[in-house]
């Protein structure tokens, strides 16, 4: 259909992580058509000859669909006519990374977006107590990192301590030969304090954190992706 | 919470004009569509127009071209309806509903027009 | 314009019972279609979206299926407040077009 005259309508993407083997999603919203038949949305990747997805006459439409892609991808369909073009990409790879362009096409006109998909493996870091250890010491595990990320401790009392001399931490390749499991263990804790391992690489940072005391040991954990 | 909160009945004599407004709180009143339905006394539902106040675009119901003129205040959050040269027929209760995050997920409570000499 | 064809009129029926609405297109609508209940004096409330979405609140007793022409709105067991005007409605072309309503009363 034509759209000449018609003016270009914003479009919206955020930079985004995938997480290898788990199902990611390209987010991509645009000023809404009111009628489903009006909208075209296509998702194309640099470097890439065909496309992503495409989706027009309220219909995905997988004719030019590049190999890389099939069976993996679908758009939010009931969410297109509200504006919602994001992508969603089943058993996301390690090639998947790169940049992505949003396309989309309504009565009302046209526009695009560019956005830098990354991909690796982040998990969340489990704290236990290490009683078997000749002095107390605590093992921080997460079992999916890549790439390999840092990792570091910190404690509520000593405040800037810097316990990498007091710590062991390994990087164990998974089965899969791409992911990692990480083992850090810092040694000579106290109790009464409040232990946080961090892990970091440069697509998400993950903090555990334990308290010790004579009568329990509480645990908190959580995940941040880095949209640098 | 959204809310379409429209203004009162009104009685007008044929030939007259009529103002509906609508005004919206709870979300992003540029972001979504605004659409006014009639709905006769006894009848069933009729799709008029529909705004999109963030441009101004606007789409109508062929039917209800030169009869129905709907426009939006961003600074008021306020959309509105006017009807013109006014009829027996045009006698109706008449709401707006806008497509948050689904299809007419929220509608006003509706505006009596009555036309009658 | 799309014809919204809805079957039957009036479906009478007693509480417990199941309730099965139809909505035929007169032309291919994808899954762009949505329904409404409808209690005299009161504004229309969306049930279903996209054919077969349940809307937020809604009690799993409302289900919707079909895509393309025919669609279905199905109440698994009416409860006294279902008694109601049914509409369904198209969103995949413009004019946006209603069913003419099926009417859910007490038998």
């Known amino acids: 259909f034509g759209i000449s005259g018609k003016h270009f309508i914003t479009v919206t993407t955020f930079t985004s992580a995938g997480n290898i083997g788990e199902d990611g999603t390209l987010s991509c919203t645009f000023e809404p058509d009111i009628k489903l038949n009006g909208i075209v949305i296509q998702w194309l990747k640099e470097g890439i000859k065909g496309l992503v997805h495409e989706f027009k006459e309220g219909k995905d439409d997988l004719s030019q669909q590049h190999e890389m892609f099939r069976g993996r991808t679908a758009v939010f369909a009931d969410q297109v006519v509200v504006g919602n073009a994001s992508l969603r990409l089943k058993n996301v790879q390690l090639t998947d990374a790169g940049t992505y362009t949003c396309y989309i096409r309504t009565s009302k006109g046209k526009g695009n977006a560019n956005l830098e998909y990354k991909t690796g493996a982040f998990s969340m870091p489990e704290i236990n107590v290490d009683y078997n250890a000749s002095s107390e010491s605590l093992r921080c595990e997460a079992p999916r990192w890549f790439p390999q990320p840092t990792v570091a401790w910190a404690s509520q009392v000593d405040q800037g301590a810097n316990f990498s001399e007091v710590s062991n931490t390994s990087f164990e390749l998974n089965s899969e030969n791409v992911t990692m499991k990480v083992v850090s263990v810092l040694y000579n804790v106290t109790i009464n304090n409040t232990y946080s391992c961090m892990i970091e690489n440069d697509i998400a940072k993950a903090t555990g954190d334990i308290k010790v005391t004579d009568s329990e040991v509480k645990r908190r954990s959580q995940l941040q992706l880095l949209n640098s | 919470q959204v809310q379409l909160v429209q203004s009162g009945a009104e009685v007008k004599k044929p030939g007259a004009s009529v103002k509906v407004s609508c005004k919206a709180s709870?979300?992003?009143?540029?972001?979504?569509?605004m659409h006014w339905v009639k709905q006769a006394p006894g009848q069933g539902l009729e799709w008029i127009a529909a705004?999109?106040?963030?441009?101004?675009?606007?789409d109508y119901n062929q039917k209800f071209k030169g009869k129905a003129k709907i426009t939006a205040v961003t600074s008021t959050s306020t959309a509105y309806m006017e009807l013109s040269s006014l009829r027996s027929e045009d006698t109706a209760v008449y709401y707006c509903?806008?497509?948050?995050?689904?299809?007419?997920?929220?509608w006003g409570q509706g505006t009596m027009v009555t036309v009658s000499s | 314009e799309i014809v919204m064809t809805q079957s039957p009129a009036t479906l009478s029926l007693s509480p417990g019972e199941r309730a099965t609405l139809t909505c035929k297109a007169s032309?291919?609508?994808?899954?762009?279609v949505a329904w409404y209940q409808q209690k005299p004096g009161q504004a229309p409330k969306l049930l279903i979206s996209?054919?077969?979405y349940r809307y937020t609140g809604v009690p799993d007793r409302f289900s919707g299926s079909g895509s393309g022409t025919d669609f279905t709105l199905t109440i698994s067991s009416l409860e006294p407040e279902d008694f109601a005007v049914y509409y369904c409605?198209?969103?995949?072309?413009?004019?946006?077009?209603f069913g003419g309503g099926t009417k859910v009363e007490i038998k």
């Open positions: 509903t806008t497509t948050v995050a689904h299809y007419f997920d929220y």
């Open positions: 709870g979300y992003t009143f540029t972001s979504y569509w």
């Open positions: 705004i999109y106040p963030g441009n101004s675009d606007t």
């Open positions: 032309q291919d609508v994808s899954f762009a």
């Open positions: 996209s054919a077969s």
């Open positions: 409605q198209q969103h995949y072309n413009t004019p946006l077009t």
